[in-house]
């Protein structure tokens, strides 16, 4: 009988230890949840305040209407230029209108003067058609003025107030474009 009682007592003690462990785990879990909630709230607040304070374009980018432009300070070939833009969440400049072309050339005059800048225009090797990087065709007034004599792939660039063409493997500055952040205010 005594043996039975001591066995029951041991079982009860074991149960108590398990419950204490469960309670400890629960307390730890609750604390962890609270910390996570705090972290989440802080993260959300930071995100919201930075979104509220942020300008439509990053630092060193120029805004015009719904676009942000970055004029590079380094030279690279056309393909590397494209990758450099992608790293910044942008693509090579795609000129949609004469107004945009005028804005770009006007800005370039102020910034750097008469240099060559790659844009997102290339000539299909088979058809000879000029296409923007997203596959769309340039408007008739925005076709490169001269056909490059290169046997290699040909890409478009801006110089002064003209669109020209050159071997894609030549080194030039480049212009990236991304969408401006919409203001929620």
């Amino acid at each position: 009988k005594l043996l039975q009682v001591s066995t029951i007592a041991m079982q009860q003690q074991e149960k108590l230890i398990q419950q204490e462990r469960a309670l400890l785990n629960f307390t730890e879990w609750k604390r962890s949840c609270a910390l996570q909630m705090k972290y989440c709230q802080a993260f959300m607040q930071n995100s919201l305040s930075s979104a509220h304070n942020s300008s439509p374009c990053p630092n060193n980018w120029i805004q015009n209407r719904e676009s942000c432009y970055y004029v590079s300070e380094i030279w690279s070939i056309w393909h590397t230029s494209q990758e450099n833009c992608l790293k910044e969440g942008s693509t090579l400049l795609q000129i949609e209108s004469k107004e945009e072309m005028d804005f770009i050339t006007g800005s370039l005059r102020k910034i750097k003067g008469s240099y060559d800048y790659w844009v997102g225009l290339s000539q299909d090797g088979h058809s000879g058609r000029w296409l923007w990087q997203d596959g769309s065709s340039p408007s008739p007034g925005l076709l490169p003025a001269e056909r490059s004599q290169s046997a290699n792939q040909v890409c478009g660039y801006v110089k002064s107030n003209s669109l020209l063409s050159s071997n894609c493997s030549t080194w030039k500055y480049f212009i990236c474009e991304k969408y401006a952040l919409r203001s929620s205010v």
């Epitope: 790293k87 910044e88 969440g89 997203d134």
Partner: nanobody, 115 residues
Framework: QVQLQESGGGLVQAGGSLRLSCAAS????????MGWYRPALGEQRELVAA???????TYVDSVKGRFSISRDNAKNTVYLQMNSLKPEDTAVYFC?????????WGQGTQVTVSS
């Protein structure tokens, strides 16, 4: 770190279609763009198509009008819809994530187009 997992490759007849998927995990908030690459003659890999987080796209001339890149932000996945496939599209297609500081590559998925 960003981990990328490609899928969707396979064997298809010329003129057929395939859709490749690239799922990103890890530090996805640092990704500014994602793209698909394939080996090219004389170069290591050529950029086939890419899409930025803002939705801007770029394609290599040889696939314009046939391939389309898109993304599903909720699934952290980028897709490459490949239509009117040609034997010359046969390659291992690699997914790449662009961040400001470094680039991350997937293991690749084989696409074979038979004539």
């Amino acid at each position: 770190q960003v981990q990328l997992q490609e899928s969707g490759g396979g064997l298809v007849q010329a003129g057929g279609s395939l859709r490749l998927s690239c799922a990103a995990s890890g530090s996805i908030f640092s990704i500014n763009a994602m793209g698909w690459y394939r080996p090219a003659l004389g170069e290591q890999r050529e950029l086939v198509a890419a899409i930025t987080t803002g939705g801007r796209t770029t394609y290599v001339d040889s696939v314009k009008g046939r391939f389309s890149i898109s993304r599903d932000n909720a699934k952290n996945t980028v897709y490459l819809q490949m239509n009117s496939l040609k034997p010359e599209d046969t390659a291992v297609y690699f997914c790449k994530a662009f961040t400001r500081d470094e680039d991350f590559w997937g293991q690749g998925t084989q696409v074979t187009v038979s004539s």
